[in-house]
């Protein structure tokens, strides 16, 4: 009779035996035979599987280095990585997170848009006609104008995307 | 409820072809491997094929080697068995039972089973 | 392809008796056997999967046990509704195969 070609997709063939995986958070000790089941350990302390596999090695825990800015958002178990972030005002400079730099400011003329978080940086947008910004700032979006009508003053000079509006005493009609 | 209903069993005549759909509810099909088993007239119970949760590994009894093939549609739900070549011994109830893994927390190794299965569809190979 | 061979292949007993089916399969397959119960014009219906364990729902007095070649399916104390037939099935390896079947019949 012919071995068999395919297995479940909790099997694994080897030997013309369609043997178990190993469960997550365990690794392969000796594959199964007619008689024998397959053998699995748990992985030990940092480190771990996080699939259905016949790995005769657990990988170990990502170690989230403080030199590049790096510290533990979640702490890894015998099934799961250990995923890092980056410490305050500093994000990511990919998705899987091996180095930080710090979050860039908006300059003056630019507000925020998006507050930079651990793994995505700010984003900046000029400020539109009416909005300005005079600072360089990672938390400061575009301020309005201020508005001289509700303050019973009249513009006086005229605001840019990068300074607000200079407000005066409206002139006195001579009688 | 979780419930399985076999479909587009009838009379073929020898050598024809008939496509049996298997129409999975109250539950995620795509995340169960399947099978198809028949039972001829008043015999035991006999393995068909089988389809992975993607559809991408397949396996069949020799009996039908070459001329049945499974397939399934995940967005619809769906299972099928497209029979081709069909024959008098090919005359039987077919099923479409649902192949589930049983977990083991203690870390033993876990076990199969066929444990949801359709009330059958009649296929009836005669001239 | 693995063999199964069930014996008996039919069986007369009567309610409160103690049954046991046996399975023995042509090569090792470990603990991968699960048995069936049917009755006529209905789906087979899991009772045991991994050689010994219980599927959920399914009373008590059911039971199986053994390991590679040789297994077991007993009812310790049959009652009026476990009248049917039995498959054992090994999900070792492909071609799935079944056992003939064990008819229990009522005394």
């Known amino acids: 009779p012919e071995p068999p070609t395919a297995c479940r997709e909790k099997q694994y063939l080897i030997n013309s035996q369609c043997c178990s995986l190993c469960q997550p958070g365990q690794k392969l000790v000796s594959d199964c035979t007619e008689f024998t089941e397959t053998e699995c350990l748990p992985c030990g302390e940092s480190e771990f599987l996080d699939t259905w596999n016949r790995e005769t090695h657990c990988h170990q825990h990502k170690y989230c280095d403080p030199n590049l800015g790096l510290r533990v958002q979640q702490k890894g178990t015998s099934e799961t990585d250990t995923i890092c972030t980056c410490e305050e005002g500093w994000h990511c400079t990919s998705e899987a997170c091996e180095s930080c730099v710090l979050h860039r400011s908006c300059s003056p003329g630019f507000g925020v848009k998006q507050i930079a978080t651990g793994v995505s940086d700010t984003i900046c947008e000029p400020c539109p006609v009416g909005f300005f910004s005079n600072v360089s700032s990672a938390f400061e979006k575009c301020h309005p104008w201020t508005s001289c009508e509700t303050k019973d003053l009249v513009v006086q000079q005229a605001g840019t995307n990068k300074t607000d509006v200079v407000c005066g005493p409206q002139d006195r009609l001579r009688a | 409820e979780v419930q399985l209903l076999e479909s587009g069993g009838g009379l073929v005549r020898p050598g024809g072809s008939l496509r049996l759909s298997c129409a999975a509810s109250g539950f995620t099909f795509g995340s169960y491997e399947m099978n198809w088993v028949r039972q001829a007239p008043g015999k035991g119970l006999e393995w068909v094929s089988y389809i992975s949760s993607s559809g991408e590994t397949t396996d069949y009894a020799d009996s039908v080697k070459g001329r049945f093939t499974v397939s399934r549609d995940n967005s619809k739900n769906l299972l099928y068995l497209q029979m081709n070549s069909l024959r008098a011994e090919d005359t039987a109830v077919y099923y479409c039972?649902?192949?589930?893994?049983?977990?083991?927390?203690?870390?033993?190794?876990?076990?199969?089973?066929?444990?949801?299965w359709g009330q059958g569809t009649m296929v009836t190979v005669s001239s | 392809d693995i063999q199964l061979t069930q014996s008996p292949s039919s069986l007369t007993a009567s309610v409160g008796d103690r049954v046991t089916i046996t399975c023995r399969s042509s090569q090792g397959i470990r603990s991968s056997l699960a048995w069936y119960q049917q009755k006529p014009g209905k789906p087979p219906k899991l009772l045991i999967y991994g050689a010994s364990s219980l599927e959920g729902g399914v009373p008590s007095r059911f039971s199986g046990s053994g390991s590679g070649t040789d297994f077991t399916l007993t009812i310790s104390s049959l009652q009026p509704e476990d009248f049917a037939t039995y498959y054992c099935q090994q999900l070792n390896s492909f071609p799935s195969t079944f056992g003939q079947g064990t008819k229990l019949e009522i005394k």
């Open positions: 039972a649902r192949d589930v893994f049983f977990f083991s927390p203690s870390g033993d190794n876990g076990a199969y089973g066929m444990d949801v």
